[in-house]
Interface confidence: low
């Protein structure tokens, strides 16, 4: 009784039923709708995408299927298609005139034309496949399982997206925001329609709000004729090169080869390839802990049934506002101030005494020559724990990022200065903030010895 | 089909060991984490831990830890919980539960349960 | 004292719709996505009914819902039958420990 997990292009759980036929209004008056939304509302500017959804629609059936033609599985593929291409931009656009018209025309169409609410699409940017139960069903197509060639098959570049998790734990969503959390416990990293990552983290020191990861479960669901479902978990002290079952492959379906896990150096560095959905996987162990980065198709990122609760997932909305330590408003206060003052100020005991401040940025100037965020991150950790191997997981963690981000111009971050409007306002780039101001945060996190 | 069938009823004496069996048949053994379950008579459900049948990893709930430990024999499909120092609040119908996906999710299917009842 | 809070009983008649509460703290309902419920007839074993707060393995009917507001987790069952009647406990993962509520149990009148 396993239960179902949604795969690639079926749609979601969310929305409507087929009705059978006849059991709707009657849908003739929605194709002039549509057609007036293609024509009156301007594009260029709104975050909703109907109107794209409404054109991929409308250049689908355009042609072969007439408003009144048969109930064919063409016209209602489409159909799905473009309800999922609805529900993907639904966030956005709450309110939309053109948008609330979509959506009850499609449930107009779907009931007339008989159209179930599962079945193959004819998205044009997915692979259009049969409907996703657990069939084992050969492709005659290779390309099915290679999200790749099947973006290129229709002339397109997907666009691609990173997240990583290292440290203490500093996290880099999908949208390049970069945030450190505390985050203890169990938290969910990625969960859409085909991959779950949930990390573990775990104080670093007795009494300690920091953390960092000392467990990682990665589920691969069950994906057509690509892939079975594979669990893959990693933690401290143990990582394997290897699925939970002990396969290193996405299974005996015919596409099992589109999922693939290659130990890098044995117990500390493993890649895993999800061709079938364009991803790449990279976790580490460096030191104790363990380091999580990711390449994804924005597509796939988006790929997603309940936008709200959206706000769960780290990589693509980040750390909710109370598990985020702000390194801003201590910059602030920093400003000026030498960090042996800070620390004497504190009430807090320092960081252990192996490790004062020049050390930290010493060996943190040594791995990472550039002052960004993943430098910032570094001093920070070493303060905060006063173990040296984290110097390592902000380097692998910057190492990651030059490998898997699309933009190369975006691989150091740095942090935006809030003071300086006029800067801002004139079109010049923010300046990085100074270090210092990371170290105040870290005095709230250090444990109390007694 | 998919079955866990556990062992028979047992009855202990207040301090002893008990060893409840579990065994797995209709799916791929290794690919799934055993979760263990108990429920003292007329009270709700109680978790007692989990285990990975591929790696032997185990999660233990804080109450119970040194006195259970799970095992797996994956040549017999085979999950094992044991608990001792047994005391009489330990009575209780012990279940095993397959974990849908992941080592912290849903139990998709469980055995019918066994009784261990703690009595001087 | 169960981690989970949910009410001791509800009630309802056929085909009515009944709902049961299940609240906890930010990190074992509120941050979690792996919120499941289990039907436990007596004398028999639970019975996955929802996972992942919404989602329904297949063979539960579709009566059955789950939702999720701030630290409270819910199950609707819409068009209560006789069948139903029976204890219902909510799971959460928080943190280390997988907790259960202490279990409500549904009356049809």
């Known amino acids: 009784m396993q239960p179902p997990r949604e795969r690639l292009v079926v749609t979601g759980r969310a929305g409507w039923m087929g009705m059978g036929r006849g059991a709707g209004r009657s849908a003739l008056g929605f194709w002039p709708t549509l057609a007036f939304l293609l024509c009156s509302f301007p594009a260029a500017t709104s975050p909703c995408k109907i109107l794209k959804c409404n054109s991929e629609f409308w250049s689908a059936t355009s042609g072969s299927h007439a408003p009144a033609s048969d109930d064919t599985p063409e016209f209602c593929a489409a159909l799905r298609s473009y309800a999922l291409c609805t529900r993907r931009t639904a966030r956005t656009c709450r309110g939309d005139l053109a948008y609330h018209s979509a959506v009850h025309g499609i449930e107009d169409l779907m009931s007339q034309h008989n159209c179930s609410k599962d079945g193959p699409t004819s998205q044009p940017r997915l692979r259009t496949l049969p409907p996703a139960g657990d069939s084992q069903e050969r492709s005659d197509s290779p390309e099915i399982c290679h999200y790749e060639k099947s973006f290129h098959k229709h002339s397109a570049t997907p666009n691609y997206t990173h997240c990583g998790l290292f440290g203490d734990p500093h996290l880099r969503t999908f949208t390049d925001r970069f945030q450190t959390c505390k985050v203890q416990g169990a938290w969910p990293l990625i969960d859409n329609n085909y991959l779950n990552v949930q990390v573990t983290n775990t104080p670093v020191l007795p009494g300690s709000a920091a953390t960092a990861t000392s467990k990682l479960t990665i589920i691969f669901k069950n994906f057509q004729e690509c892939v079975d479902q594979k669990v893959y978990q990693a933690e401290m002290d143990e990582l394997p090169a290897a699925f939970v079952d002990g396969s290193k492959n996405g299974g005996d379906k015919h596409g099992a080869n589109s999922l693939k896990i290659t130990e890098k150096v044995s117990g500390q560095h493993v890649e895993i390839q999800a061709k079938y959905i364009g991803t790449t996987i990279v976790v580490r162990q460096v030191g104790r802990y363990l380091t999580f980065a990711v390449r994804m198709p924005e597509e796939v990122v988006n790929a997603v049934e309940d936008w709200d609760s959206q706000g769960l997932y780290l990589c693509l909305r980040g750390c909710p506002l109370n598990q985020q330590i702000d390194f801003q408003a201590f910059h602030t206060n920093a400003e000026g101030t030498g960090a042996r003052r800070l620390a004497a100020a504190s009430p807090a005991p320092t960081a252990p005494e192996t490790f004062p401040y020049e050390t930290a940025v010493a060996k943190c100037k040594e791995k990472l020559p550039v002052e960004d965020l993943y430098y910032q991150a570094c001093v920070f950790d070493l303060l905060t724990t006063g173990d040296v191997n984290f110097t390592l997981a902000a380097y692998y963690a910057l190492e990651d990022v030059k490998m898997l981000h699309s933009n190369k111009d975006k691989l150091h971050l740095y942090e935006r200065t809030r003071d300086l409007p006029g800067r801002a306002a004139a079109g010049l780039p923010l300046a990085p903030r100074p270090l210092l101001g990371a170290l105040v945060p870290l005095l709230a996190l250090l444990p109390v010895f007694c | 089909e998919v079955q866990l069938v556990q062992s028979g009823a047992e009855v202990k004496k207040p301090g002893a060991s008990v060893k409840v069996s579990c065994k797995a048949s209709?799916?791929?053994?290794?690919?799934?984490?055993i979760s263990w379950v108990r429920q003292a008579p007329g009270q709700g459900l109680d978790w007692m831990g989990w285990?990975?049948?591929?790696?032997?990893?185990?999660n233990y709930a804080q109450k119970l830890q040194g006195r259970v430990t799970m095992t797996t024999d994956t040549s017999t499909s085979t999950a094992y919980m044991e608990l001792s120092s047994l005391r009489s609040e330990d009575t209780a119908v012990y279940y095993c539960?397959?974990?849908?996906?992941?080592?912290?999710?849903?139990?998709?299917?469980w055995g019918q349960g066994t009784l261990v009842t703690v009595s001087s | 004292q169960s981690a989970l809070t949910q009410p001791r009983s509800v009630s309802g008649s056929p085909g009515q719709s009944v709902t049961i509460s299940c609240t906890g703290t930010?990190?074992?309902?509120?941050?979690?996505?792996?919120v499941s419920w289990y039907q436990q007839h007596p004398g028999k074993a639970p019975k996955l009914m929802l996972y992942?707060?919404?989602k329904r393995p297949s063979g539960v009917p579709d009566r059955f819902s789950g939702s999720k507001s701030g630290n409270t987790a819910s199950l609707t069952i819409s068009g209560l039958q006789a069948e139903d009647e029976a204890d219902y406990y909510c799971?959460?993962?928080?943190?280390?420990?997988?907790?259960f509520g202490g279990g409500t149990k549904v009356t049809v009148l």
């Open positions: 539960a397959r974990v849908g996906s992941g080592p912290y999710y849903y139990m998709d299917v």
């Open positions: 209709g799916y791929t053994f290794t690919s799934h984490g």
């Open positions: 285990i990975s049948p591929y790696s032997g990893n185990t």
């Open positions: 930010s990190s074992s309902v509120g941050d979690s996505i792996y």
């Open positions: 992942d707060v919404t």
């Open positions: 799971c959460s993962y928080a943190g280390t420990d997988t907790l």
